[in-house]
């Protein structure tokens, strides 16, 4: 039998996606572990297998269908369990009964660009990916900067309280190397978090004119 | 819908070799657990082997631990069996089934399946 303590927990990327992450002190590294959803009104389950992502962790990805179709609901309950081998049998080692649209996290917003910059400032925009119709106006968005000589978690934070999809920076130095992170959330769910932060756009601003105050 | 279609059945002597193929499409194929199945003449269809979503654990029935092995690629949409040192009783139509919920494929009732490939195994 393993003992230890258990944390199992999973979001739902609003589409057809549920990643879980299954934490157990002195679990086995080789048992198979299966996660299995099994939805309380629809007509199929899901299985995934879990995967070592460290000493003591594990995970997995629930793919319920094509990237942009909307498998679950806002009253949709799905029962999550974990499943180990041990011998012959399959023993569960835990159990959630999980509401999709309270557990959300999105994908990182993709296609970032630079839309037009300039010495002192630049306009950036971008795009939510696999995001359901049902949030319509409903999300927001934290955008950060990082400028040369300092860290990610340097880097101020910016709030978008609305679906804004770009951002114009400004105060920005005259002929400076930049990158710029974005990610977004849900205002819908009690236990929605944000999305993973976007890769990294790298821009350059525009130098000084020569001879010109700037 | 899902749609299987296997490949490679053929008639091979006793101790030969043969590689089947099923590929996968209309649907995300690492959504799928898959399996290989087999039915002889005047038989019920039995499970032979299966592979997990994501290709690390895969399960045999007894009589062909150690000769049989499968795999999949899912940047393909394909699931293999590789099946060594063949035997006459290994002679049936093997079938290829893929169903979302690993827990149910052994049961036969609600898989997706393929069409089926003839393997002759002569003596």
């Known amino acids: 039998a393993v003992n230890g303590t258990s944390q199992f927990t999973c979001f739902y990327n609003s589409r057809a996606n549920i990643s879980c992450v299954w934490s157990q002190d002195g679990a086995l590294q080789d048992t198979s572990c299966q996660v299995h959803a099994w939805p309380d009104r629809r007509r199929w389950n899901q299985t995934c297998e879990l995967l070592p992502v460290s000493q003591a962790s594990w995970a997995c990805n629930l793919i319920l269908g094509a990237p942009d179709s909307q498998k679950l609901t806002t009253v949709d309950i799905v029962t999550l369990r974990v499943l180990c081998r041990e011998g012959v049998r399959w023993r569960v080692m835990a159990i959630q009964d999980f509401k999709p649209f309270e557990n959300l996290r999105l994908m990182a917003p993709i296609s970032l660009q630079v839309v037009h910059v300039e010495t002192h400032r630049c306009n950036i925009s971008w795009e939510i990916s696999q995001a359901s119709h049902y949030f319509e106006r409903h999300l927001e968005f934290e955008a950060r900067t990082l400028s040369p000589g300092h860290t990610w978690e340097e880097a101020p934070l910016l709030t978008l309280k609305q679906k804004q999809e770009w951002i114009c920076l400004e105060t920005l130095t005259p002929d400076t190397q930049y990158e710029f992170q974005v990610r977004v959330k849900p205002l819908q769910g009690e236990f929605t978090t944000w999305s993973p932060w976007s890769q990294p756009l790298a821009f350059r601003t525009k130098p000084a004119a020569l001879g010109k105050d700037t | 819908q899902v749609q299987l279609v296997e490949s490679g059945g053929r008639l091979v002597q006793a101790g030969g070799s043969l590689r089947l193929s099923c590929v996968v499409s209309g649907d995300v194929f690492v959504r799928y657990t898959m399996a290989w199945f087999r039915q002889a003449p005047g038989k019920e269809r039995e499970f032979v082997a299966v592979?997990?979503?994501?290709?690390?654990?895969?399960e045999y029935v007894g009589s062909v631990k150690g000769r049989f092995t499968v795999s999949r690629d899912n940047a393909k949409n394909t699931v293999y069996l590789q099946m060594n040192n063949l035997k006459p009783e290994d002679t049936a139509v093997y079938y290829c089934?893929?169903?979302?919920?690993?827990?149910?494929?052994?049961?036969?009732?609600?898989?997706?399946w393929g069409q089926g490939t003839q393997v002759t195994v002569s003596s």
């Open positions: 592979v997990t979503d994501s290709g690390r654990t895969t």
């Open positions: 089934a893929a169903n979302t919920d690993y827990f149910q494929i052994r049961s036969v009732d609600n898989n997706a």
